[in-house]
């Protein structure tokens, strides 16, 4: 099948999110990509969405991320807004209700998003050729 519009939206969101870093993109998340050899594509998307949801649920009101000024607050709101969009689109692509995330490995959110972007771009190149 041709490239899903959701996939294009995910790549666009990831491109934006990886343009710049913030204090809180340096925080850690579960690295689901470390040992994902026996995982289906849908499971990978589902687990990625789960990780993102765990991150923004935990850090949405984190004072370290919110900062001390209106400008810092705006930046954090931007981050959360884009992560929520990514989460929503990944769930749509996965089409699964839930999936376990049990890995012990950690990576920064920044690296997690870069890895996810690579995977999504690979998927896009396959479905567009």
């Amino acid at each position: 099948h041709k490239c899903d519009i959701t996939l294009q939206e995910i790549i666009k969101t990831l491109n934006s999110l990886t343009e710049q870093k913030t204090l809180c993109t340096e925080l850690t998340v579960t690295d689901i990509f470390a040992a994902s050899k026996n995982t289906t594509e849908k499971e990978t998307f589902c687990r990625a969405a789960t990780v993102l949801r765990q991150f923004y649920s935990h850090h949405e009101k984190d004072t370290r991320c919110l900062g001390a000024t209106a400008q810092q607050f705006h930046r954090h709101k931007q981050l959360i807004r884009f992560l929520k969009r990514l989460d929503r689109n990944l769930w749509g692509l996965a089409g699964l209700n839930s999936c376990p995330v049990k890995e012990a490995n950690q990576s920064t959110l920044e690296n997690f998003l870069e890895r996810l972007k690579t995977i999504m771009r690979e998927k896009y190149s396959k479905c567009s050729s």
């Epitope: 710049q20 870093k21 913030t22 204090l23 209106a70 400008q71 705006h74 884009f82």
Partner: antibody, heavy 118, light 107 residues
């Protein structure tokens, strides 16, 4: 490709008004904040105002509160700057700039020259 | 408002030399400092954000450092196209403010 194109500059008499426009393309307009920055001839950069394009909330530098009004039309992907009670010292190149997703201003228009003179 | 003071006003150097530009803030901006390059007749271009992060497509010869009130932009080896005016800017709090600029000119 992200593009910002300003228009609306020109010659205006002291006390007059002018509305600048900035047409944005190549990205989702409401995902990024927008700014106006000006530069008087031979001088440095001066930040004027920014707007949260999603909510419409503006933040002005003190010198521009009351005289200048920023607005946007999300359906047209366009930013505006309404300038009233213009003075000779408002003569400058006015740039619109996109706020980086988190920091700074990552894309700039080519600028539009506003000359306030009698 | 936070005042940014850049020094020197002008830096006269030859291609291949190292350029060190300074920016001092009147109060702490933590790490929320950026640097821009502007050439005559052109709009500014974002080089560095969040003190030390190079923006997309900016060559590795540009680097930023500092924190709090003191920030530095370093160009490790000047290329002919690097001769321009450089501005620091803080986006820690509104109003956003710029330094007065440092002109890097050919010696």
């Amino acid at each position: 490709e992200v593009q910002l194109v300003e228009s609306g500059g020109g010659l205006v008499q002291p006390g007059g008004s002018l509305r600048l426009s900035c047409a944005a393309s190549g990205y989702t307009f409401t995902d990024y904040s927008m700014h106006w920055v000006r530069q008087a001839p031979g001088k440095g950069l001066e930040w004027v105002v920014w707007i949260n394009t999603e909510t419409g909330e503006p933040t002005y530098a003190d010198d521009f509160k009351g005289r200048f009004t920023i607005s946007r039309d999300n359906s047209k992907n366009t930013l505006y700057l309404q300038m009233n009670s213009l003075r000779a010292e408002d003569t400058a190149v006015y740039y619109c700039a996109r706020g980086g997703i988190f920091y700074g201003m990552d894309y700039w228009g080519q600028g539009t020259l506003v000359t306030v003179s009698s | 408002e936070i005042v940014l003071t850049q020094s020197p006003a002008t830096l006269s150097l030859s291609p291949g030399e190292r350029a060190t530009l300074s920016c001092k803030a009147s109060q702490s901006v933590i790490n929320d400092a950026a640097w821009y390059q502007q050439k005559p007749g052109q709009a500014p271009r974002l080089l560095i954000y969040y003190t030390s992060h190079r923006y997309t497509g900016i060559p590795a010869r540009f680097s930023g450092s500092g924190s709090g009130t003191d920030f530095t932009l370093t160009i490790s080896s000047l290329e002919p196209e690097d001769f321009a005016v450089y501005y620091c800017q803080q986006d820690y709090t509104s109003p956003w403010t710029f330094g007065q600029g440092t002109k890097v000119e050919i010696k």
